[in-house]
C-alpha cells in the first residue's frame, strides 16, 4: 500500500527473510504519513511492513548484520 | 501459558563447547520468537541472541555472534543454543525465555514472560 | 545498540515504604520497556510490560511509568516478598538490552 513513494499502510502477510534483499526506513516526519519499514525482495517488489512487529524487527536485524558483515 | 523445560547443569573444560536445549510445550512454538539470555555469578542479565523458528535464521548480540549458535527444531518444539570456545568467564546461568506476544502481534511488545528455570553452566579445568 | 542505565544499583528500604528505581535509555523506545523481578536462583518474573502495563498476577503495589527515555518502577508500599533485585528491558529493537539491576534489601 503506497503512493508516490510513502507506504500508506502495511502488509497483512508475513514475508520469510529469504525473499528480502534489503530494506528502507520511512519515516512520519519527513514527508510521509506513517512510520513503515519498505522490504525490498529478490522479485523486485516493494512491501511496506510495521516496525513495530517482531517480525519486522527481526529482518531488519538480521539484513543490517549482514550489511555490517559484507 | 507455555512452560520451558532446559537440560540439566553442565561442567566443561576451557576451549570445548555446551550446547543447552529447551524444549516448549502447552503453546504454539513457530509463532514466538525465543531469546537466550545469560547471568553470570552475582551479575546482572545479558540477551545472547535468539529465533523465530518460522525463519530459522538467529540473530546474535555483537558480543557473542562469534562463538554463539541458535537453533529450533519445529518437529519437537525445541530451541537449542550452542557456545564454543568456552573459558572461565562463560561460568553462568544459561536462560531460555519465550516471547509475551507472537512476531505478527500489532504492538510487538516482546517483553518475554516464558523462562526456562535455567542450565548452569561451570567452565573449570 | 541501546544502553539501558538503571539507578540506583542498591537500595536499602524498609516494610510499607515507597520505592522508585529508574531506568534511562541512550535513545528513544517510545514505551517499549518492561520490568522484572528476579529473587536468588530464580528466573526472572515479568512485571510490567510496555512501560506501564500490570502484568496478569502481579499485585497492583507495582507500576510503572514514563516514556522515550525515562522510566520508573515504583512499589507503592513495600511488601517482605518484595526484596529481590529487579531489571529493566528494552524491547524496541534488536538486540534486546538490560539494565544492569537494582538490589532491594531490606533496611
Known amino acids: 500500500a503506497s503512493n508516490f513513494d510513502c507506504c500508506l499502510g502495511y502488509t497483512d502477510r508475513i514475508l520469510h527473510p529469504k525473499f528480502i534483499v534489503g530494506f528502507t526506513r520511512q519515516l512520519a516526519n519527513e514527508g510521509c504519513d506513517i512510520n513503515a519499514i519498505i522490504f525490498h525482495t529478490k522479485k523486485k517488489l516493494s512491501v511496506c511492513a510495521n516496525p513495530k512487529q517482531t517480525w519486522v524487527k527481526y529482518i531488519v536485524r538480521l539484513l543490517s548484520k549482514k550489511v555490517k558483515n559484507m | 501459558q507455555v512452560q520451558l523445560v532446559q537440560s540439566g547443569a553442565e561442567v566443561k573444560k576451557p576451549g570445548s563447547s555446551v550446547k543447552v536445549s529447551c524444549k516448549a510445550s502447552g503453546g504454539t512454538f513457530n509463532r514466538y520468537a525465543i531469546s537466550w539470555v545469560r547471568q553470570a555469578p552475582g551479575q546482572g542479565l545479558e540477551w545472547m541472541g535468539g529465533i523465530i523458528p518460522m525463519f530459522a535464521t538467529p540473530i546474535y548480540s555483537q558480543k557473542f555472534q562469534d562463538r554463539v549458535t541458535i537453533t529450533a527444531d519445529e518437529s519437537t518444539s525445541t530451541a537449542y543454543m550452542e557456545l564454543s570456545s568456552l573459558r572461565s568467564e562463560d561460568t553462568a546461568v544459561y536462560y531460555c525465555?519465550?516471547?509475551?506476544?507472537?512476531?505478527?502481534?500489532?504492538?510487538?511488545?516482546?517483553?518475554?514472560?516464558?523462562w526456562g528455570k535455567g542450565t548452569l553452566v561451570t567452565v573449570s579445568s | 545498540d541501546i544502553q539501558m542505565t538503571q539507578s540506583p544499583s542498591t537500595l536499602s528500604a524498609s516494610i510499607g515504604d515507597r520505592v522508585t528505581i529508574t531506568c534511562r535509555a541512550s535513545?528513544?523506545?517510545?514505551?517499549?520497556l518492561a520490568w522484572y523481578q528476579q529473587k536468588p536462583g530464580r528466573a526472572p518474573k515479568l512485571l510490567i510490560y510496555?512501560?506501564?502495563s500490570l502484568q496478569s498476577g502481579v499485585p497492583s503495589r507495582f507500576s510503572g511509568s514514563g516514556s522515550g527515555t525515562d522510566f520508573t518502577l515504583t512499589i507503592s508500599s513495600l511488601q517482605p516478598e518484595d526484596f529481590a533485585t529487579y531489571y529493566c528491558?528494552?524491547?524496541?529493537?534488536?538486540?534486546?538490552?538490560f539494565g544492569g539491576g537494582t538490589k532491594l534489601e531490606i533496611k
Open positions: 528491558l528494552q524491547d524496541s529493537d534488536y538486540p534486546l538490552t
Open positions: 525465555a519465550r516471547d509475551r506476544t507472537d512476531y505478527y502481534d500489532t504492538d510487538g511488545y516482546q517483553s518475554p514472560d516464558s
Open positions: 510496555a512501560a506501564s
Open positions: 535513545q528513544g523506545i517510545n514505551n517499549y
